[in-house]
Amino acid sequence: VQVLNLQARLRVLEMYFLNDTLAAEDSPSFSLLQSAHPGEHLAQGASRLQVLQAQLTWVRVSHEHLLQRVDNFTQNPGMFRIKGEQGAPGLQGHKGAMGMPGAPGPPGPPAEKGAKGAMGRDGATGPSGPQGPPGVKGEAGLQGPQGAPGKQGATGTPGPQGEKGSKGDGGLIGPKGETGTKGEKGDLGLPGSKGDRGMKGDAGVMGPPGAQGSKGDFGRPGPPGLAGFPGAKGDQGQPGLQGVPGPPGAVGHPGAKGEPGSAGSPGRAGLPGSPGSPGATGLKGSKGDTGLQGQQGRKGESGVPGPAGVKGEQGSPGLAGPKGAPGQAGQKGDQGVKGSSGEQGVKGEKGERGENSVSVRIVGSSNRGRAEVYYSGTWGTICDDEWQNSDAIVFCRMLGYSKGRALYKVGAGTGQIWLDNVQCRGTESTLWSCTKNSWGHHDCSHEEDAGVECSV
C-alpha cells in the first residue's frame, strides 16, 4: 500500500515538473506574470526552477528507497499465501509532510483564507489482520457415508489342535467285496485225509466186464489217488469282521467365503447450511464424534486348519459286507507227498466214477512237438480238426508260455484221442474252458494228432 501511495505521489510531482518547465509558455499563469511583471519574471523563474530540481532529486531518492522496500516486500514468502478476504478500509492517511519553503515571492496582498482542499484519495488497503482465535468446536458431523468394505482379513493363525475325537459309531455295513483275484498255484499239498463221498459224476466209459471176485480181505490202503476234479463250491463262509477304520482323511479344503452381511440403513442427512465466506484457516478443531460404523468388510479367509485331533477310539466293527464272488480257482497244486500208511479203515460204499485231474504235455522237445492231455488216468492226443494258433496259445499258456503256434503232422501218438474240434478264442486260461467235443468223442486217427510250438 505504501508503495502505491509513493508511486502516486511521484507521478504528481513529475506532472508538475513537466508542466512548469517544458510547457511554461502555454501556462496562463506564466503569461500573466510575464505581462504583469515582465522585469521580475526571469529572476522568479530561475529560482523556482532550482526548487523544482531539488524536489525532483528528493523524489528520485525517495523512489529508490521505495524500490528497495518493494524488493523486500515482494521477496517476502508471505506474498504467496492464499489471498485473504478484503480488509476493512484503512484509516485516513496522515497529512503529507510540509513542502519545502518556496523562494520568497514578492510580498503580495494578504490572501483570503483558501477553500478547504479536496478530500485525499483513499489510502491503500491495509495489511491483513492477525490470525483469528481458534474456531469453536464444530458440531458433530452428519453420519458418514457407508464405509467401503474392509480389506480381506489376514489369514488366521492355525487353530489349536483338536481334542481327541469321541469314539466313532459302528461302521456301516460294508459294500459287497469284489470278485477275488485268481489264486496262485497252490503249494505242494499235504497228504489229504480220506475224502467224503464224491458227487455223482457223469457215467464213465463202460469198462470191460470183470470176472466177479470173491470178497477180498481188507487190503492195506494204497497211495492216495490223483486229486479229483475240484469239489463243489463250499458254503459261503461266515462274514469276516470289519477291518479297523482307516486313519482320518486329509483335511478338506476351506469352505467358500461367506457372502457379505447386509448393509446397515444410512442415517438421515442433516439439512445443508448455506456456505459462509471462508475465514482465515482456524486451528484444527477437536475431533468430531465418530460417524456410524461403515458396512462390515468381507470375511477374511479361513485360517490354516489346526493339526488333526488325536485319532478317536476305534469304532465298533460294522456289520460284515456280503461275501464277494469267489475268485477263479488257482492252478492245481503239485501232488502231495505220499502219506504214511494209516490203519486200515472200514471199507466204504462204492462211489460213483468221478473224473480225474487233467494236465498237458508236449511230446518231442520241451517247447515243440505233439500236444497231449492227461485224463482219466491216461495220456491222450488232440485231433487237429479245427486246431489253430488260438488253441495252441491256450495250450502253451497252461505250460507257462506266453506264445503258441499250431503245428500239424508232428508224429502220430498212441492210445486215446481225448479231444477233437477244440475251438478256443485264445483268451481262455485252460483248454477245458474252450468249446470242444466231449472227452473221447472224435472221428480222427493218430495221423491227425495236433502239435504246438510254444514260446516265452
Partner: antibody, heavy 120, light 107 residues
C-alpha cells in the same frame, strides 16, 4: 533226401498268366505244409503263399492276394502256383519250400527255383 | 507287417574268425525265428529254427540266441564253406517276413 523240382517259369507279358509246378519226392508229401517263396534278381527273399497238408488252409502275401492261387494234388505229389495278371515286379526266381510240419512252419527244404520274367 | 532288420548288411572276415550277425524285429515275436544260409545261384538252406534249435545236419559251430525282438546268429569259427548270405525270418504271424540279408565275405 527230400527233392523239390520247380517248373513252368519263363517269359510272359504284363497282364499274362503262368502256372508253376513243384514236383515232390522222397518224403510223404501229403504230411507237410508247402510254400512258395520268391527272390527278385539281386534282392532278398519274399514269402508269398502257404497251403496246409490237407489243403484246408491257404495263406497269401498282400502283394499277390487275388492274383495268385496255391493248390496241391497229394495223389500226384505236386504243388502248384497259378499266377494271373502278372506285373513287371513279379519278375523273380520262384522257389517251392517244404514246411517242417503239416501247416505253417519253418522252411526246411527248398527246390532249385524257376525264373519268371514279366516283360513286354 | 513285422519288419525284420539285419546288421551289418555285409561283413568281411577270415577263416577261423568268430562272427556275429544280428536281427531285430519291429515287434516281439517270442522265439519264432529262423536263420537261413544262401550261396550264389543256390536255394536257401535252413540252419536254425525256434530261435536256437539247430536243424539236423547243420554243423555245431552255428548257434542262435535271443527272444522277443533281438536275435543273434553266431559262427564260432568260420570255415571256407560258410562264406554266403544269411537271412533271418519271423514265423510269428502272417505274412512271414525275411531280413534284407547279411553278406559274409572273405577278408
Amino acid at each position: 533226401e527230400v527233392q523239390l523240382v520247380e517248373s513252368g517259369g519263363g517269359l510272359v507279358q504284363p497282364g499274362g498268366s503262368l502256372r508253376l509246378s513243384c514236383a515232390a519226392s522222397k518224403f510223404t508229401f501229403s504230411n507237410y505244409g508247402m510254400n512258395w517263396i520268391r527272390q527278385a534278381p539281386g534282392k532278398g527273399l519274399e514269402w508269398i503263399a502257404l497251403i496246409y497238408y490237407n489243403s484246408n488252409n491257404k495263406y497269401y502275401a498282400d502283394s499277390v492276394k487275388g492274383r495268385f492261387t496255391i493248390s496241391r494234388d497229394n495223389s500226384k505229389n505236386t504243388l502248384y502256383l497259378q499266377m494271373n495278371s502278372l506285373r513287371a515286379e513279379d519278375t523273380a526266381v520262384y522257389y517251392c519250400a517244404k514246411s517242417l510240419t503239416g501247416g505253417s512252419d519253418y522252411f526246411d527244404s527248398w527246390g532249385q527255383g524257376t525264373l519268371v520274367t514279366v516283360s513286354s | 507287417d513285422i519288419q525284420m532288420t539285419q546288421s551289418p548288411s555285409s561283413l568281411s572276415a577270415s577263416v577261423g574268425d568268430r562272427v556275429t550277425i544280428t536281427c531285430r524285429a519291429s515287434k516281439s515275436i517270442g522265439t519264432f525265428l529262423a536263420w537261413y544260409q544262401q550261396k550264389p545261384g543256390k536255394a536257401p538252406k535252413l540252419l536254425i529254427y525256434s530261435g536256437s534249435t539247430l536243424e539236423s545236419g547243420v554243423p555245431s559251430r552255428f548257434s542262435g540266441s535271443g527272444s522277443g525282438t533281438d536275435f543273434t546268429l553266431t559262427i564260432s569259427s568260420l570255415q571256407p564253406e560258410d562264406f554266403a548270405t544269411y537271412y533271418c525270418q519271423q514265423h510269428d504271424e502272417y505274412p512271414f517276413t525275411f531280413g534284407q540279408g547279411t553278406k559274409l565275405e572273405i577278408k
